[in-house]
Interface confidence: medium
C-alpha cells in the first residue's frame, strides 16, 4: 500500500527572465527514492537517478540547473514556460508518486509565490 | 566503483545447459532505468549482445538465440543470471555482463554497457 | 536487425600519427527523441571492451581526449589522434537504436 504523500511548491509566479526552484518532497513512506523525473507537459526535463546522478534533457541543458537537493532550477524564463510541471518520484517498493506545480511566468515585476498544497 | 564479475561452469558438454552468473557492485537492479546486459565474444571473433534484465523486470533477448535463453536475476544479492539451453561447440565463448540503463530513458546514452565484467571462458566439448 | 559494417578490418599506425576508422549502419540510428544511438568500444588485448565514445562524439569517464567522434545518421567516424602504444587493440561501433543490439566486426589497430 502506498502511504506516502509530495508535498510541492504549489502554484508559483516568477519574472520573465528570471530563475525560479521546482521543489517537491516525499514523505510519510519509507520507500527508497530510486529516482526523480522533472517533466513538463509531455516533455522529460531532467532525471535525477539514485545510482547514475543528474541528467538534464539536451533541449534543456541550457536553461535548467539540478538542485537544490532533488528540485530542479528554471533559469532564463520565458511567458512560453508558463505551465504545470510534475515531479515524479520512482520508488521502491511502493512504486510512482506524483507531484504537480503550476508555474506562472509574468511581464510584471510583481511575482507572488502561492502556498504550498499537497498530493497524496 | 562499479564492477562485475562474471562466473560459470568453464567446461560443459553439447546439450548441456549453460548456466552464468553476474555478481555486481556499486550499483542495484532496483533502481529505475538499470540493468544488466550479457554479450559475448566467440574465440576470436567479434561482440554478440544475448539479453538484457531491467530493475522492473522486464527482459530484452536477442531473437536469434531467444528460445534458448533465460535471463533472470537477485536483486537482493546483487546478481543477474544467463541460461543457454541445448549447448553446442558454437557456444565456445567468452560471456561478459556488463551494467546498462536503458536506451530513451537515459538518452545520451552514457551508461550503455558503460562498464563490462573481465568475462567468463566458456567451453563447449564433447 | 541493424546492420554495422566497419572499415578497415585492420590499420596500423606509427606512433604519434592519426588513425581513423569508419563505421556505417543499415538504418539511420538517430532516434525521435533527437539523440542517435551509436557508441564506439576499445577492447584491448585480453582486456574485456571498454565504453570510449556514446552519442556519436561524447568522451566517456576517464577516456582520453585524443579520442574523438563524428558522423550522422548511417556514417561515423572514430579519430585516434597522437596514437599510443596503449591505444593498440580492436575497436567496435554499436548500435542501441533497437534490440538486437548490433556491433561492427571490430578494427584491429597496431602500431608500425
Known amino acids: 500500500m502506498m502511504t506516502g504523500t509530495i508535498e510541492t511548491t504549489g502554484n508559483i509566479s516568477a519574472e520573465k527572465g528570471g530563475s525560479i526552484i521546482l521543489q517537491c518532497h516525499l514523505s510519510s513512506t519509507t520507500a527508497q527514492v530510486t529516482q526523480v523525473n522533472w517533466e513538463q507537459q509531455d516533455q522529460l526535463l531532467a532525471i535525477c537517478n539514485a545510482d547514475l546522478g543528474w541528467h538534464i534533457s539536451p533541449s534543456f541543458k541550457d536553461r535548467v540547473a539540478p538542485g537544490p537537493g532533488l528540485g530542479l532550477t528554471l533559469q532564463s524564463l520565458t511567458v512560453n514556460d508558463t505551465g504545470e510541471y510534475f515531479c515524479i518520484y520512482h520508488t521502491y517498493p511502493d512504486g510512482t508518486y506524483t507531484g504537480r506545480i503550476f508555474l506562472e511566468v509574468l511581464e510584471s515585476s510583481v511575482a507572488e509565490h502561492g502556498a504550498r498544497f499537497q498530493i497524496p | 566503483q562499479v564492477t562485475l564479475k562474471e562466473s560459470g561452469p568453464g567446461i560443459l558438454q553439447p546439450s548441456q545447459t549453460l548456466s552464468l552468473t553476474c555478481t555486481f557492485s556499486?550499483?542495484?537492479?532496483?533502481?529505475?532505468?538499470?540493468?544488466v546486459g550479457w554479450i559475448r565474444q566467440l574465440s576470436g571473433k567479434g561482440l554478440e549482445w544475448l539479453a538484457n534484465?531491467?530493475?522492473?523486470?522486464?527482459?530484452y533477448y536477442n531473437p536469434s538465440l531467444k528460445n534458448r535463453l533465460t535471463i533472470s536475476k537477485d536483486t537482493s544479492n546483487n546478481q543477474a543470471f544467463l541460461k543457454i539451453t541445448n549447448v553446442d561447440t558454437a557456444d565456445t565463448a567468452t560471456y561478459y555482463c556488463?551494467?546498462?540503463?536503458?536506451?530513451?530513458?537515459?538518452?545520451?546514452?552514457?551508461?550503455?554497457?558503460?562498464?563490462w565484467g573481465q568475462g567468463a571462458s566458456v567451453t563447449v566439448s564433447s | 536487425d541493424i546492420m554495422m559494417t566497419q572499415s578497415p578490418l585492420s590499420v596500423a599506425v606509427t606512433p604519434g600519427e592519426s588513425a581513423s576508422i569508419s563505421c556505417r549502419s543499415s538504418?539511420?540510428?538517430?532516434?525521435?527523441?533527437?539523440?542517435?544511438?551509436l557508441s564506439w568500444y576499445l577492447q584491448r588485448p585480453e582486456k574485456s571492451p571498454q565504453l570510449l565514445i556514446f552519442?556519436?562524439?561524447n568522451l566517456a569517464s576517464g577516456v582520453s581526449d585524443r579520442f574523438s567522434g563524428s558522423g550522422s545518421g548511417t556514417d561515423f567516424t572514430l579519430i585516434i589522434s597522437k596514437v599510443e602504444t596503449e591505444d593498440v587493440g580492436i575497436y567496435y561501433c554499436?548500435?542501441?537504436?533497437?534490440?538486437?543490439?548490433?556491433f561492427g566486426a571490430g578494427t584491429k589497430l597496431e602500431l608500425k
Open positions: 556499486g550499483f542495484s537492479l532496483r533502481t529505475y532505468g538499470l540493468g
Open positions: 552519442q556519436i562524439s
Open positions: 556488463a551494467r546498462i540503463a536503458r536506451p530513451h530513458y537515459y538518452w545520451d546514452g552514457r551508461y550503455i554497457l558503460d562498464v
Open positions: 534484465i531491467w530493475w522492473d523486470d522486464d527482459e
Open positions: 538504418k539511420s540510428l538517430l532516434h525521435s527523441n533527437g539523440i542517435t544511438y
Open positions: 554499436m548500435q542501441f537504436l533497437e534490440v538486437p543490439y548490433t
